[in-house]
Interface confidence: medium
């Protein structure tokens, strides 16, 4: 079930001939309130790019702008995961990555950003108006999700700019914190107050909202305890669904665990033991479509293409089995 809340976006005041300063002064408390609420709260950005080389191949990049540690990233298409969206990949900092077709290569780019390449052919490949969503679960901020899609008129090879358009889901209480944003905001507010403290008090005017204003759109969290914070957010509902996937498929997109780590901890014989011997990386990623689930000792930095050996935390085994780069 999906619950949608639509909230008008905050609009900047429109200064008229009279009362321009009044509007600005009136908005100060709101600016302060906004800063206080958003300071320390993370944001998720999503960038969707259509590759020039393969017209139906997409690259999705997502990042988390927050100070917490990321515990899980879920990438879905067709809407948020669990709300009509189909999971494409799940990235876990320690247990590795599992991806489903048409995802071809998912990987960590930095400690707080990931990228996902979708295969460009076949019935299950995406099309230009598909919506892609990234959900970052972090501690202590909670769960944060944003969606993005390719602009309708995008040329191949061009990308939609990173869109920090989050659906904010506060799974955990206390998403406040002192940050540079708050500091800057407070300094700026003080500066404005100092500049305008001798101006006459303005007339109160109702703030105007543009009918074209983007609307906040929030999907109800799966747990009752989750409070939804609505931020201005615009999405394009996908009318193009992969032919091989069920439209009602919240979890299921297709296929297997791929592994990822370039800095990996090797598990030796015996499921109980963990060795600290790192395996040197020879690049960043090999997609293993059979369902490899590899241990990442730490999230790998962005490295060049190539081959990586993937140890696995899931039991006593040597490198064996299919390592098919899709």
């Amino acid at each position: 079930m999906r619950t949608e809340a639509q909230v008008p976006a905050l609009q900047p005041p429109e200064p008229g001939l009279e009362g321009a300063m009044g509007h600005r002064t009136l908005v100060l408390p709101w600016v302060l309130l906004t800063l206080c609420v958003t300071a320390g709260t993370p944001e998720v950005w999503v960038q969707v790019r259509m590759e020039a080389t393969e017209l139906s191949s997409f690259t999705i990049r997502c990042g988390f702008l927050g100070s917490g540690s990321i515990s899980l990233v879920t990438v879905s298409w067709g809407g948020p995961n669990g709300a009509g969206g189909t999971t494409l990949a799940v990235l876990h900092p320690e247990r590795g990555i599992r991806q489903w077709a048409p995802a071809r290569q998912a990987r960590w780019e930095t400690q707080s950003s990931i990228s996902l390449i979708l295969e460009g052919s076949g019935a299950s490949s995406p099309c230009a108006n598909t919506t892609f969503c990234c959900k970052f679960a972090s501690f202590p901020e909670g769960s944060w999700e944003a969606c993005g899609s390719l602009p309708p008129s995008s040329d191949p090879g061009l990308s939609a700019p990173p869109t920090p358009a989050p659906i904010l889901r506060a799974d955990l209480a206390g998403i406040l914190g002192v940050s540079g944003v708050l500091l800057f905001g407070c300094v700026y507010l003080l500066h404005l107050l100092r500049r305008h403290k001798h101006r006459p008090a303005p007339r109160l005017q109702p703030s105007r909202t543009s009918p074209q204003a983007p609307r906040a759109r929030a999907w109800a969290p799966s747990q009752a305890s989750q409070a939804a914070l609505h931020v201005p957010y615009a999405t394009i509902n996908t009318s193009c669904r992969p032919a091989t996937l069920d439209t009602a498929h919240p979890h299921g997109g297709p296929s297997w665990w791929a592994s990822l780590p370039t800095h990996a901890a090797h598990r030796p014989q015996g499921p109980a033991a963990w060795a600290s011997t790192p395996i040197p990386a020879r690049g960043s990623f090999v997609s293993v479509e059979n369902g490899l689930y590899a241990q990442a000792g730490e999230r790998p930095p962005h490295t060049g293409p190539g081959l990586t050996l993937f140890p696995d935390p899931r039991g006593p085994r040597a490198m064996e089995g299919p390592l098919g780069v899709r």
Epitope: W100, T244, S255, W256, N290, G291, L292, P313
Partner: antibody, heavy 123, light 111 residues
Framework: EVQLQQSGAELAKPGASVKLSCTVS????????IHWVKQRPEQGLEWIGG????????VSASKFQDKATITADTSSSTAYMQLSSLTSGDTAVYYC????????????????WGQGTSVTVSS | DIVLTQSPASLAVSLGQRATISCRAS??????????MHWYQQKPGQPPKLLIY???NLESGVPARFSGSGSGTDFTLNIHPVEEEDAATYYC?????????FGGGTKLEIK
């Protein structure tokens, strides 16, 4: 020895819910996925969904999305599946199974299975 | 969902002869040379038992008379020579996409 021990048979009324359990031994439940498969009388096998107990991540078939809820408790090495709003169509044997662990590959091939739990929905 | 069609639905084979079971997928289940098809054996009142994984790999403990082959959309399970204990229903299962699906089953009888 790897074993998956499932809970006993259930007789339920339409509209009710049942929660099946699958307790594993002989391996660490965190090391692989646990899947649930449905088999109706004299019929074939249907994959319901699976869970990675280590992180609680679940995947499931769309047709069972509103029917089955899969969870796991790593401290007791037990996976659970709750079936809700039962109808006669839910009458079946439900198996839990371990995703095949070999080398460092997992393929959703299931190498060890529980003995099955029979669920009968009848008024 | 990928549909797996098994044939024949039932099969009677003389002891010591070859049993051949086919499984056809509605779309390819192979990628980069690897085929995500598995075979199971199920006897009445028992859970399924994994025989073959990734089209042709024999699961540990399974007799060598079982073999699997195929790629793309067409796969075959061969049992040779057939023994009395092989009487069972055999299922193919793909893992190319979610949801993994099973074939309808082939019931093998020993003559």
């Amino acid at each position: 020895e790897v074993q998956l021990q499932q809970s006993g048979a259930e007789l339920a009324k339409p509209g009710a819910s049942v929660k099946l359990s699958c307790t594993v031994s002989g391996f660490n439940i965190k090391d692989t996925y646990i899947h649930w498969v449905k088999q109706r009388p004299e019929q074939g096998l249907e994959w319901i969904g699976g869970i990675d107990p280590a992180i609680g991540n679940t995947v499931s078939a769309s047709k069972f999305q509103d029917k089955a809820t899969i969870t796991a408790d790593t401290s007791s090495s037990t996976a659970y599946m709750q079936l809700s709003s039962l109808t006669s169509g839910d009458t079946a044997v439900y198996y839990c199974a371990r995703e095949r662990v070999h080398s460092n590959t997992l393929y959703y091939a299931m190498d060890y299975w529980g003995q099955g739990t029979s669920v009968t929905v009848s008024s | 969902d990928i549909v797996l069609t098994q044939s024949p639905a039932s099969l009677a084979v003389s002891l010591g002869q070859r049993a051949t079971i086919s499984c056809r997928a509605s779309k390819s289940v192979s990628i980069s040379g690897y085929s995500y098809m598995h075979w199971y054996q199920q006897k009445p009142g028992q859970p399924p038992k994994l025989l073959i994984y990734l089209a042709s790999n024999l699961e540990s403990g399974v007799p060598a008379r079982f073999s699997g082959s195929g790629s793309g959309t067409d796969f075959t399970l061969n049992i040779h020579p057939v023994e009395e204990e092989d009487a069972a229903t055999y299922y193919c299962q793909h893992s190319r996409e979610l949801p993994p699906t099973f074939g309808g089953g082939t019931k093998l009888e020993i003559k």
